[in-house]
């Protein structure tokens, strides 16, 4: 029997019946065996076919076989109900070999010309399968010349059989207190030849509960327990399963915080698998009872390990653990079923005893000594000599624990001394002056420190004076002996004050005229205001209307009198303001240098002389009565004048205070 070409020779060619295209002889038998390379098949088709027709092709025939399988037995010229002629059909080998057998019997009724066929090797597309047949590959099939290969979707790995995709389903660890896990692809069929391991690992103290949900379908066997595919559940205490079949397993209360779930599948079957919903429980903690005036959040039916609650107090109540305040409180349930900290109290906010108000007092409005939330107190200043600055003195104990004014201020009100009060009625006639009576000049300050000078009290801790009077002590403020509240210069009965700092106007030049002859002394303590010690007011913007030419001002001091000695008793003099041009002119003639009188000065005195301030009065205040407020204010500071006090045609020269209000305010606010 002739053999066809064998691989690796080119596999293609022609076959024909003996004698073709002539008629074939009787009693012929020919066999051709064609072999293609692995992964290839043989294709065969006929270009001519003319054989004797017989029932079931018993007489003459061409038989095509591939391995043990007969592909076709052919005869005749055209197919009938029981016989087949190739016509235009193409035949394919099942593997890489094809056997062709031609046979003719002992006779032919008429001449038949036989057949001619052509064959060739072609690649098998292993990826194409007939309907109903198992696919070549589990997931993806890739054909190539002479063969094919399989690959898998993400999350799978090719089994060593090179066709099955096993799920990569191990190593998943679930750490949440509840969750779901299922067989791969659920609810679609689970993969073959897979071994899945899932771990649930919760904190110690939790117990895992497993519920099988929806559906359960794992390949089973009627007699043997789960021989093919199975699900097992393992804890540190016991093993549950194996499970298979179609019945949902019962709830499993593992009493363990760690669970391992194993799912193993074989190479066959088509089942949807399983789904587990897991929860956890733990020993519950005692139900938290909110303290009075507080509430628990969140509210739960029960609280187990890791659950927590917070306490929130009503407005006006605060969290306290004993005496210690807390801004927030959260307790956490522990594995032994106890809370990690005890319940605090919600105590009513207590603002505590209010601070004492210097030069004032406090009154409990709500009730004696009541200092809790919403309690009201009233601050007031000592009448006559002090007045409350800014607020009305009413304070409420607010939820934040601070006494708070109606304007929202948490700081104490300020009792500011009332300024410009005097016992004196205007009228009456230092040089050429009169003795002051108690309370006439309560702002008068005696400054001793090398020389005798004066000043005027501002507020309760500042003294306004002349720069030239304290220039020598500017770097040694503590050397100044400051006395107030007395009329007699040498009296042992006075209020002593000491200087903390001396501020001399930066525009003042010592021994070069008296421009900017103004200074402030800061006292190291506040003085107590009374009828004999009261500050002078600073001039209002409108004050100039009370300081026009010929308006009367009052100067006071212990300076030289007509007798040429320092006064023992405080003296004062009422003197009119002098026209500025007139005063300037009076000091233009020698021995005074030109420009001695500046716009920062004002002059006062009589043209005829006799009434003046003198040496020892320096730094004292020239005061005026503001008839609108009925308070005295400082218009001038005793600065300089003629060598002979009270000289006719010469005037006392005073620092014009209204020009220095910004300077004074800046120093006082900064220091």
């Amino acid at each position: 029997t002739p053999l066809g070409p064998k691989w690796p020779e080119p596999v293609f060619g022609r076959l024909a019946s003996p004698g073709f295209p002539g008629e074939y002889a009787n009693d012929q038998e020919r066999r051709w065996t064609l072999t293609a390379p692995p992964g290839y098949r043989l294709r065969l088709y006929f270009t001519h076919f003319d054989l004797e027709l017989s029932h079931l092709c018993e007489y003459d025939f061409v038989k095509l076989s591939s391995g043990a399988k007969v592909l076709a037995t052919l005869c005749g010229q055209e197919s009938t109900d029981t016989e087949r002629a190739p016509g235009k059909d193409t035949f394919y080998s099942l593997g890489s070999s094809l056997d062709i057998t031609f046979r003719s019997d002992y006779s032919n009724e008429k001449p038949f010309t036989g057949f001619e066929a052509f064959y060739a090797a072609e690649d098998i597309d292993e990826c194409q399968v007939a309907p109903g047949e198992a696919p070549t590959c589990d997931h993806h099939c890739h054909n190539h010349l002479g063969g094919f290969y399989c690959s898998c979707r993400a999350g799978y790995v090719l089994h060593r059989n090179k066709r099955t995709c096993s799920a990569l389903c191990s190593g998943q660890v679930f750490t949440q207190r509840s969750g779901e896990l299922s067989s791969p692809e659920y609810p679609r069929p689970y993969p073959k030849l897979s071994s899945c391991t899932y771990s649930i690992s919760l904190e110690e103290g939790f117990s895992v509960i497993l519920d099988f949900v929806e559906s359960f379908d794992v390949e089973t066997h009627p007699e043997t327990l789960c021989p093919y595919d199975f699900l097992k559940i393992q804890t540190d205490r016991e093993e549950h399963g194996p499970f298979c079949g179609k019945t949902l397993p019962h709830r499993i209360e593992t009493k363990s915080n760690t669970v391992t779930i194993t799912f193993v599948t074989d190479e066959s079957g088509d089942h949807t698998g399983w789904k587990i919903h897991y929860t956890s429980t733990a020993q519950p903690c005692p139900y938290p009872m909110a303290p009075p005036n507080g509430h628990v959040s969140p509210v739960q039916a029960k609280y187990i390990l890791k659950d927590s609650f917070s306490i929130f107090c009503e407005t006006g109540y605060e969290l306290l653990q004993g005496h210690l305040p807390l801004k927030s409180f959260t307790a956490v349930c522990q594995k032994d079923g106890s809370w990690d900290r005890p319940m605090p109290a919600c105590s009513i906010v207590d603002c505590g005893p209010p601070d004492d108000l210097p030069s004032g007092r406090v009154e409990y409005i709500t009730g004696p000594g009541v200092t809790t939330y919403k309690a009201v107190i009233q601050y007031s200043c000592e009448e006559t000599f002090y007045t409350m600055k800014v607020n009305d003195g009413k304070y409420v104990c607010e939820a934040d624990g601070f006494w708070t004014s109606s304007k929202g201020e948490k700081s104490l009100p300020v009792c500011e001394p009332v300024c410009g009060l005097s016992a004196r009625t205007t009228g009456g006639r230092i040089y050429g002056g009169q003795k002051a009576k108690p309370g006439d000049f309560p702002w008068q300050v005696l400054i001793l420190g090398g020389t005798t000078a004066a000043g005027a009290l501002l507020y309760d801790n500042w003294v306004l004076t002349a720069a030239h009077a304290v220039y020598e002590q500017k770097h040694d403020a503590s050397a100044l002996d400051i006395r107030m509240g007395t009329l007699k210069r040498l009296s042992p009965h006075y209020t002593q004050a000491w200087s903390e700092a001396v501020f001399i106007h930066e525009g003042y030049t010592h021994d070069a005229g008296f421009d900017n002859d103004i200074a402030l002394i800061k006292l190291n303590n506040k003085v107590v205001i009374n009828s004999n010690i009261t500050p002078i007011c600073l001039p209002r913007k409108e004050a100039e209307s009370f300081m026009r030419t010929d308006d009367i001002g009052t100067a006071s001091g212990w300076g030289l009198t007509q007798r040429g000695f320092l006064a023992r008793n405080l003296m004062y003099v009422d003197i009119p303001i002098v026209d500025h041009q007139k005063c300037t002119a009076a000091y233009e003639k020698p021995p005074y240098p030109r420009g001695s009188v500046t716009a920062n000065m004002l002059c006062a005195g009589l043209e005829s002389g006799g009434k003046d301030s003198c040496r020892g009065d320096s730094g004292g205040a020239l005061v005026f009565l503001d008839s609108e407020t009925e308070r005295w204010f400082v218009g001038g500071i005793v600065s300089w004048g003629s060598m002979n006090c009270g000289e006719a045609g010469q005037y006392g020269v005073y620092t014009k205070v209204i020009n220095y209000i910004p300077w004074i305010e800046n120093i006082i606010s900064d220091f």
Epitope: G322, P325, K327, G401
Partner: antibody, heavy 115, light 107 residues
């Protein structure tokens, strides 16, 4: 990690004021809790002096109330102790601390009152 | 002021033993009591708060108990590093007050 650190002069003259600073790192003094000053005398006796709370409210030991002031600077996360008119009896190691809910103490600073 | 009395100034024990340090309040302080351990040259370190709650990181051989006026710190299985002075403290009311201390000596 929460840390408290005391600082201030180690020697103070009688009748003067003692001023100490506690610098807190790792936690804001306005977030929660009471921020305390505690002192330990020679012989180890401990005395609570007072606190300033997260809200700025103060509570003082009544035995010191006329002399003590506790303040804070929230921008620097510091709180301060001022004790006026000190005597030799105020010689001690001074600690700043959070008590109760969290427990953190400074390492302490030794203050001697002596002329 | 509430006085916290630690009647035993010194206590002697051996490694592995169990020892109880007591503290008595002069009036009811509920459970608002803390226990402190102070080793020489160190700041006090809190062990227990609210009478029986252990601070995190404190070994479980330290146990606190009591309420009202009588309080106990128990150290089971005493270790050599437990050599220290132990103070109780009440924070129930102003002023907060400390006990005078109990020194634990290891035999």
């Amino acid at each position: 990690d929460v840390q408290l650190q005391e600082s201030g002069p180690g020697l103070v003259k009688p009748s003067q004021s003692l001023s100490l600073t506690c610098t807190v790192t790792g936690y804001s003094i306005t977030s929660d809790y009471a921020w305390n000053w505690i002192r330990q005398f020679p012989g180890n006796k401990l005395e609570w002096m007072g606190y300033i709370s997260y809200s700025g409210r103060t509570s003082y030991n009544p035995s010191l109330k006329s002399r003590i002031s506790i303040t804070r600077d929230t921008s620097k996360n510091q709180f301060f102790l001022q004790l006026n008119s000190v005597t030799t009896e105020d010689t001690a190691t001074y600690y700043c601390a959070i008590l109760y809910a969290m427990d953190y103490w400074g390492q302490g600073t030794s203050v001697t009152v002596s002329s | 002021d509430i006085v916290m009395t630690q009647s035993q100034k010194f206590m002697s024990t051996s490694v592995g033993d169990r020892v109880s340090v007591t503290c008595k309040a002069s009036q009811n302080v509920d459970t608002n009591v803390a226990w402190y351990q102070q080793k020489p040259g160190q700041s006090p370190k809190a062990l227990i708060y609210s009478a029986s709650y252990r601070y995190s990181g404190v070994p479980d051989r330290f146990t606190g108990s009591g309420s009202g006026t009588d309080f106990t710190l128990t150290i089971s299985n005493v270790q050599s590093e437990d050599l220290a002075e132990y103070f109780c403290q009440q924070y129930n009311s102003n002023p907060l007050t400390f006990g005078s201390g109990t020194k634990l000596e290891i035999k």
